[in-house]
């Protein structure tokens, strides 16, 4: 058993049928010695008396808010949550496996640049009685500071019969140098509590591996005289790290016909312009990627050919 | 990217081309190592990230773009003195900081070159003959060093009398390649920045 926060405790249980559970001793936070009784949640049934209460915690029915009273007055509370260990592995019931980029990916994180700011998100099908708390650091043995905001509900989607809820959080490394070569990964830890179930999820990454630039901005077409060709031009996104000559991007320019079956013409360039043939009803799209470290491509920025 | 690429002008800066070749070569070598050594811990998540140049060179600090020198998190008090002549410096633009930066890069390359050559000698003794260093990568390191053209004492190749532990050697190769790839990215960024300025 360990303390999650004041008056909230997590009981770790080896979870299998007929398991013996864990013996827990609760102590009433009071100078009083006599006439103390204990109850669980809203029930008025007295579970025991005295300054301490010893309970055998086996199942969720044994978890909840234990309260000690004296003469009708509440003295203190202890909330017991359960953390299930199933065959040596902590349970992951609360969050959905996003399966990207690999199986058992519960937290996904992205950064728009090298400033040390990043966003993480996760999915769940649970809509109520759900709380999250996020902590982060650079490294784990001698951790350096990363400050995270509160997790917020960022999207709701319907997937088949189920509703899916996306939560996200923004974090900022306290003293980040965009040019630094990372040798210690960022660690992100999410505590999730659903009713009386506690779970924790972690992710470990280097900012360089989660970079995904915003799409190029100001995408424009300039027709070339007496030609089917057009000059496409664009700019680096505002959110990208500066100076751009140091934090350079490379670009992919795509000409896509109206039909998805039509052949796509693609050109790669390090410049912020390219000359392509603009077909009728086609559209031109451009996306960006760090020129020197191949992390994710940005989403496409698009303009119609006409 | 096996599709048409609009190639940029080589520019005035002779080292840019070499640094781009270096990054390409080390990235290919790392990819090859990860595939060949699939049963070894060779991925970024599995290895310890060690920097053999730590406390010996200060490339990131010495080569910091002017725009980032205002960022206190980027300024490290490490001071390292370097020789300051080199053919990549366009004489008019030669500045003390730029010379420090390029000599720091040269020292990095020299250190990695020695490590890689020592390691290759061990790998050649492996009866499994599972993996060797790409000669192209070693050649590209050499070319960039020549382009930088700094006078510096030659570091003798480390020789070891004890029987090599091939498992440890292969894991060390992965660690070195990951670190060298990160340094090659920094070198490429620096060359691109210097080329633009």
């Amino acid at each position: 058993i360990w303390e999650l926060k004041k008056d909230v405790y997590v009981v770790e249980l080896d979870w299998y049928p007929d398991a013996p559970g864990e013996m827990v001793v609760l102590t009433c936070d009071t100078p009083e010695e006599d006439g103390i009784t204990w109850t669980l949640d809203q029930s008025s049934e007295v579970l025991g008396s005295g300054k301490t209460l010893t309970i055998q915690v086996k199942e969720f029915g044994d978890a909840g808010q234990y309260t000690c009273h004296k003469g009708g007055e509440v003295l203190s509370h202890s909330l017991l949550l359960l953390h299930k260990k199933e065959d040596g592995i902590w349970s992951t019931d609360i969050l959905k496996d996003q399966k990207e980029p690999k199986n058992k990916t519960f937290l996904r994180c992205e950064a728009k640049n090298y400033s040390g700011r990043f966003t993480c998100w996760w999915l769940t099908t649970i809509s109520t009685d759900l709380t999250f708390s996020v902590k982060s650091s650079r490294g784990s043995s001698d951790p350096q500071g990363v400050t995270c905001g509160a997790a917020t509900l960022s999207a709701e989607r319907v997937r088949g019969d189920n509703k899916e809820y996306e939560y996200s959080v923004e974090c900022q490394e306290d003293s980040a140098c965009p040019a630094a070569e990372e040798s210690l990964p960022i660690e992100v830890m999410v505590d999730a509590v659903h009713k009386l179930k506690y779970e924790n999820y972690t992710s470990s990454f280097f900012i360089r591996d989660i970079i995904k630039p915003d799409p190029p901005k100001n995408l424009q077409l300039k027709p070339l005289k007496n030609s089917r060709q057009v000059e496409v031009s664009w700019e680096y996104p505002d959110t990208w790290s500066t100076p751009h000559s140091y934090f350079s991007l490379t670009f992919c320019v795509q000409v896509q016909g109206k039909s998805k079956r039509e052949k796509k013409d693609r050109v790669f360039t390090d410049k912020t312009s390219a000359t392509v043939i603009c077909r009728k009803n086609a559209s031109i799209s451009v996306r960006a990627q760090d020129r020197y470290y191949s992390s994710s491509w940005s989403e496409w920025a698009s303009v119609p050919c006409s | 990217r096996n599709l048409p690429v609009a190639t940029p002008d080589p520019g005035m800066f002779p080292c840019l081309h070499h640094s781009q070749n270096l990054l390409r070569a080390v990235s290919n070598m790392l990819q090859k190592a990860r595939q060949t050594l699939e049963f070894y811990p060779c991925t970024s998540e599995e290895i310890d990230h060690e920097d053999i140049t730590k406390d010996k060179t200060s490339t990131v600090e010495a080569c910091l773009p002017l725009e980032l020198t205002k960022n206190e998190s980027c300024l490290n008090s490490r001071e390292t003195s370097f020789i300051t002549n080199g053919s990549c410096l366009a004489s008019r633009k030669t500045s003390f900081m730029m010379a420090l930066c390029l000599s720091s890069i040269y020292e990095d390359l020299k250190m990695y070159q020695v490590e890689f050559k020592t390691m290759n000698a061990k790998l050649l003794m492996d009866p499994k003959r599972q993996i060797f260093l790409d000669q192209n990568m070693l050649a590209v390191i050499d070319e960039l060093m020549q382009a930088l053209n700094f006078n510096s004492e030659t570091v003798p190749q480390k020789s070891s009398l004890e029987e090599p532990d091939f498992y440890k050697t292969k894991i060390k190769l992965c660690i070195l390649l990951h670190a060298f790839r990160i340094r090659a990215v920094t070198i490429d960024r620096v060359m691109s920045y210097l080329n633009a300025s």
Partner: antibody, heavy 115, light 112 residues
Framework: QVQLVQSGGGVVQPGRSLRLSCAAS????????MHWVRQAPGKGLEWVAF????????YYADSVKGRFTISRDNSKNTLYLQMKSLRAEDTAVYYC????????WGQGTMVTVSS | SYVLTQPPSVSGTPGQRVTISCSGG????????VKWYQQLPGTAPKLLIY???QRPSGVPDRFSGSKSGTSASLAITGVQAEDEADYYC????????????FGTGTKVTVLG
Amino acid sequence: QVQLVQSGGGVVQPGRSLRLSCAASGFTFSSYGMHWVRQAPGKGLEWVAFIRYDGSNKYYADSVKGRFTISRDNSKNTLYLQMKSLRAEDTAVYYCKTHGSHDNWGQGTMVTVSS
Amino acid sequence: SYVLTQPPSVSGTPGQRVTISCSGGRSNIGSGTVKWYQQLPGTAPKLLIYGNDQRPSGVPDRFSGSKSGTSASLAITGVQAEDEADYYCQSYDRGTHPALLFGTGTKVTVLG
């Protein structure tokens, strides 16, 4: 004490269907994940499928994906394995099993796929 | 499709020490725990060892388990006639959990 009693096995022709049941007692069935494991005659153990305590997630071995469906009825304390498009290579003793560091197995039920 | 490799058979005379190996990889035994089962002819498997080296109550202390790197082993010190059975190791792959990975199985023969 914990008990898992299996039923539903038998002889079936290739391409036909069969449903196995596993009735649980002696524990809170709705709190625990459950597996199906099979063993072909004279061969080793092969995992078939898993279902979460609440039925929300199901996992299958590649060899049965798209043909077998694991399900549970927590109100009846029963685990099921619906097997469709049966093949000769599905011939085996099928076991249900609880998920956890200490596990309990059903007695097994024989499924024979033969024409 | 078996990723955990066991020797097909091992044998010993009563009182001898018998060991069974189970060889896996970094993503299964290397990053998780191992169980061992005993299966007597015509019966369901019985748990002998969980969590690499833990014995459930009721399992004789002549059975012991260990794990090192990407391999595990089961030792029977002072093997007895009633230990003649098939033995299976089991683990999980970190990418496909909760799918169970079973070893190929080992037939233990106790020589008269």
